[in-house]
């Protein structure tokens, strides 16, 4: 690694990043025929243009606007599932409940899911060695700004009843510093969104506590109510059974509480 290269605290760009983004884009247009008009080469060019040759601590939402424009997508606004610290279950759910969407079920979320990227000021190189860490280096890095931008837009698009899946195993079930807590909650539009319904996912088999009474959930309820949006909360005591019942709602065991 050349000496002059800035060393950041976070992992570097995911290997084969350009190839991965392009392959995912083409795959998405295959899986989602309604997006087949998308020009994946142009999408990659816009993605690249957002961070290449720019200081990776000085990225703005404006940098991502060309990509946002190309990735414009209409999802049913009343079928949105937000999540916080429980991505895998949220994605398993939307894979079964095909009419509901997480951010990662949209083109832009699908492209970037689990990837890291950054460039370097004044060079066209992608930095595969290290990228800024949100805490240790800077918050205005390419990855954080991307997720902030797409999360804001996703939340702004939501209407009617919005669902959010929260991890009941964590000390902070609702975390104000998460993307959900810091971006999505504040960008739900009260004139469009009637209710935010939280699903608190239990981790332990024998955990029968009502986690909807958790202080952090009460904090979420307070924030939401102040924004003139109704709040409701459900405990999901058995996530495995919950998924099974989404797959087979007629199953006789699915009438009891899950």
């Amino acid at each position: 690694v050349p000496r002059w290269r800035q060393q950041w605290s976070g992992p570097g760009t995911t290997k084969r990043f350009p190839e991965t983004v392009l392959a995912r884009c083409v795959k998405y247009t295959e899986i989602h025929p309604e997006m087949r008009h998308v020009d994946c080469q142009s999408v990659w060019d816009a993605f690249k243009g957002a961070f290449i040759s720019k200081h990776p601590c000085n990225i703005t939402e404006e940098d991502y606007q060309p990509l946002m424009k190309l990735g414009t997508q209409t999802v049913p606004c009343n079928k949105i599932l937000l999540w916080s610290r429980i991505k895998d279950l949220a994605h398993q759910f939307t894979q079964v409940q095909r009419d509901m969407f997480t951010l990662e079920d949209t083109l832009l979320g699908y492209l970037a899911d689990d990837l890291t990227w950054c460039g370097e000021f004044n060079t066209s190189k992608i930095n595969y060695q290290s990228c800024p860490d949100w805490r240790k280096d800077c918050s205005n890095n390419p990855v954080s700004v991307f997720w902030k931008t797409v999360s804001r837009r996703f939340a702004e698009a939501a209407c009617d009843v919005v669902h959010v899946m929260l991890n009941g195993s964590r000390s902070k079930i609702f975390d104000k510093n998460s993307t959900f807590g810091s971006v999505e909650v504040h960008n739900l539009q009260p004139e469009k969104v009637q209710t935010l319904e939280a699903w608190v996912i239990h981790g332990g088999r024998e955990d029968s506590r009502d986690l909807c009474q958790d202080p952090t959930i009460k904090e979420l309820e307070s924030i939401i109510s102040k924004r003139n949006i109704q709040f409701s909360c459900k405990n999901i005591y058995r996530p495995d059974k919950f998924l099974q019942c989404v797959k087979n709602p007629e199953d006789s065991s699915c009438t009891s509480e899950i």
Partner: antibody, heavy 115, light 107 residues
Framework: QVQLVQSGAEVKKPGASVKVSCKAS????????IDWVRQAPGQGLEWIGL????????KYNEKFKGRVTLTADKSTSTAYMELSSLRSEDTAVYYC????????WGQGTLVTVSS | DIQMTQSPSSLSASVGDRVTITCKAS??????VAWYQQKPGKAPKLLIY???YRSSGVPSRFSGSGSGTDFTLTISSLQPEDFATYYC?????????FGQGTKVEIK
């Protein structure tokens, strides 16, 4: 510039198979899906299926499933459509097309099925 | 499969006329509709995608509208080079399907 060049016209007997090629140039072959569409003489357009040249995965119109096979050779940037158990109603011009906001189509390949 | 019913199947018009072609989908396809123009012996050419977006190089006299199940292609002022057959296509779900075509002829 972008070009999709298809193989020449074919005359086949009923029950035979035909393989039509579509050579792409002027763009990165793996960055776009390739559709196959046919048009019987004096008739409308009918979608046969598509291939993702990067992964090789395919989607077929149920009407053709079991009779059509779509493949792609990344090394030569060529897509292929093979149709088997040909019958007279398969007589048509077969087109390949690259997807996107500015799609490009091949010039078409006339396949005539006649005994 | 989603059926696309196009009307009329043919029409006669003069240069300068405003021409409207409609397409009805058998189920909701959102805005996932494209319009193609085809001239004899040639491959189809994309005019409109996502209901109302013109493809690159397509003249502004071509416009599309609609959503859900009802879609329209309008040629605001017919030019000599516009005499051709027009097809709608839905790409909201597989298999992709086309309308049966509308032939625009010289009056």
């Amino acid at each position: 510039q972008v070009q999709l060049v298809q193989s020449g016209a074919e005359v086949k007997k009923p029950g035979a198979s035909v393989k039509v090629s579509c050579k792409a140039s002027g763009y990165t072959f793996t960055n776009y899906l390739i559709d196959w569409v046919r048009q019987a003489p004096g008739q409308g357009l009918e979608w046969i299926g598509l291939i993702n040249p990067g992964s090789g995965s395919t989607k077929y119109n149920e009407k053709f499933k079991g009779r059509v096979t779509l493949t792609a050779d990344k090394s030569t940037s060529t897509a292929y459509m093979e149709l088997s158990s040909l019958r007279s109603e398969d007589t048509a011009v077969y087109y390949c097309a690259k997807t996107g906001t500015l799609p490009y189509w091949g010039q078409g390949t006339l396949v005539t099925v006649s005994s | 499969d989603i059926q696309m019913t196009q009307s009329p199947s043919s029409l006669s018009a003069s240069v300068g006329d405003r021409v409207t072609i409609t397409c009805k989908a058998s189920q909701n396809v959102g805005t996932s509709v494209a319009w193609y123009q085809q001239k004899p012996g040639k491959a189809p050419k994309l005019l409109i995608y996502s209901t109302s977006y013109r493809s690159s190089g397509v003249p502004s006299r071509f416009s599309g509208s609609g959503s859900g199940t009802d879609f329209t292609l309008t040629i605001s002022s017919l030019q000599p080079e516009d005499f051709a057959t027009y097809y709608c296509q839905q790409y909201g779900s597989y298999p992709l399907t086309f309308g049966q075509g509308t032939k625009v002829e010289i009056k």
